[in-house]
């Protein structure tokens, strides 16, 4: 799987999950989140050659098409597969509120 | 929705479904399919700016990150959303066989 275990410990050039830290204030302009100040969101990057973690029948076809037509702009793209939630703390007035923001952290990628 | 109805009748620059015809023999090397000789597979292409048909909370965050960090390589990607099957006919010896190949045609796209 193109997950953090594999991708973070390798120098994989193809589609893989990459490290990305997002600072809520600086990178998103979200000033309302009290904790954490930012988080490791990660992102997906890298080419999707033939057979590289292809998601559907269509992505297999497109990767194969791409191999037969190398100049084509039609190619599968490296996108998130498994996403995880992020617990945050913010204030409603003086009252702290703990919430899970769903689908915030990329754990693995796929070619779609 | 970024579907064929909208995308094929517009000059949309952002993420949208685009026309692509695939010839089984020439483009995939699949010689065994008797009918059709090829099909309109389509593909997804175009930038994914902030708020453009974003798929998950994560893709919203990433698009926003991208807006704050325009030079970053982390950005959502335009990928298939709705896929449809393709009926084919091939011969097993002298006997024709009709089969549905699942997830072969892109009907709409999303930013993931």
């Amino acid at each position: 799987a193109l997950d953090t275990n594999y991708c973070f410990s390798s120098t994989e050039k193809n589609c893989c999950v990459r490290q990305l830290y997002i600072d809520f204030r600086k990178d998103l302009g979200w000033k309302w989140i009290h904790e954490p100040k930012g988080y490791h969101a990660n992102f997906c990057l890298g080419p999707c050659p033939y057979i590289w973690s292809l998601d559907t029948q269509y992505s297999k076809v497109l990767a194969l098409y791409n191999q037969h037509n190398p100049g084509a702009s039609a190619a599968p793209c490296c996108v998130p597969q498994a996403l995880e939630p992020l617990p945050i703390v913010y204030y409603v007035g003086r009252k702290p509120k703990v919430e899970q923001l769903s689908n915030m952290i990329v754990r693995s990628c796929k070619c779609s | 929705a970024l579907d064929t109805n909208y995308c094929f009748s517009s000059t949309e620059k952002n993420c949208c479904v685009r026309q692509l015809y695939i010839d089984f023999r020439k483009d995939l090397g699949w010689k065994w399919i008797h009918e059709p000789k090829g099909y309109h597979a389509n593909f997804c292409l175009g930038p994914c700016p902030y708020i453009w048909s974003l798929d998950t909370q994560y893709s919203k965050v990433l698009a926003l990150y991208n807006q704050h960090n325009p030079g970053a390589s982390a950005a959502p990607c335009c990928v298939p959303q709705a896929l449809e099957p393709l009926p084919i006919v091939y011969y097993v010896g002298r006997k024709p066989k009709v089969e549905q190949l699942s997830n072969m045609i892109v009907r709409s796209c999303k930013c993931s």
Partner: antibody, heavy 121, light 111 residues
Framework: QVQLVQSGAEVKKPGASVKVSCKAS????????MNWVRQAPGQGLEWIGQ????????NYNEMFEGRATLTVDTSTSTAYMELSSLRSEDTAVYYC??????????????WGQGTLVTVSS | DIVLTQSPASLAVSPGQRATITCRAS??????????MNWYQQKPGQPPKPLIY???NLESGVPARFSGSGSRTDFTLTINPVEADDTANYYC?????????FGQGTKVEIK
């Protein structure tokens, strides 16, 4: 160059199942049908069935329908043949063999080295 | 299923001589202008090796000493001249109809 490398020999008890693997390299795995053929000791060759890796489309010899299951893992370019409810008559060398690409049923141009499956109580 | 009958079951040939193996199908294997008949060579402990496809087309890398002929139900594999390395079992196979079937094999020995 094209290579099909099969898993090692197996000894199974009657009634059990066996799963043989065939790892392909040197060609585009999802472009060719993969066939499975067996050969009982000192006997002729018998076609079990075939699978098209890109779609998972399968065709089986009626003799093996319901007992043989063909699958693939396209991420590792590996084909699998599982045979269930084994009996002593299933003792044979099992081969994977690539179809040459023109038709579904085709001449088989590359063969694995074979996997001996012995069914014995 | 189409039944393929090979003859002879075995034959011994001297080096430099001609070896002829015949394969008779229980029904025609011709279709789309082709004869769907293939020939394979198998040596002990090895997988079958393709020799001929579509009745008469030589697989790449196969010596021109091997040739195939025939149509409909009657087919022939000829090795001329035979060499010591040709000791093996030879199988015909039809792929005109599912399931593909094989002949029972012909054992060729070099005297």
């Amino acid at each position: 160059q094209v290579q099909l490398v099969q898993s090692g020999a197996e000894v199974k008890k009657p009634g059990a199942s066996v799963k043989v693997s065939c790892k392909a390299s040197g060609y585009i795995f999802i472009t060719y049908w993969m066939n499975w053929v067996r050969q009982a000791p000192g006997q002729g060759l018998e076609w079990i069935g075939q699978i098209f890796p890109a779609s998972g489309s399968t065709n089986y010899n009626e003799m093996f329908e319901g007992r043989a299951t063909l699958t693939v893992d396209t991420s590792t370019s590996t084909a699998y043949m599982e045979l269930s409810s084994l009996r002593s008559e299933d003792t044979a060398v099992y081969y994977c063999a690539r179809g040459d690409g023109n038709y579904a049923l085709d001449a088989m141009d590359y063969w694995g080295q074979g996997t001996l499956v012995t069914v014995s109580s | 299923d189409i039944v393929l009958t090979q003859s002879p079951a075995s034959l011994a040939v001297s080096p430099g001589q001609r070896a002829t193996i015949t394969c008779r199908a229980s029904e025609s294997v011709d279709n789309y202008g082709n004869s769907f008949m293939n020939w394979y060579q198998q040596k002990p402990g090895q997988p079958p090796k393709p020799l001929i496809y579509f009745a008469s087309n030589l697989e790449s890398g196969v010596p021109a000493r091997f040739s195939g002929s025939g149509s409909r139900t009657d087919f022939t594999l000829t090795i001329n001249p035979v060499e010591a390395d040709d000791t093996a079992n030879y199988y015909c196979q039809q792929n005109n109809e599912a399931p593909p079937t094989f002949g029972q094999g012909t054992k060729v020995e070099i005297k």
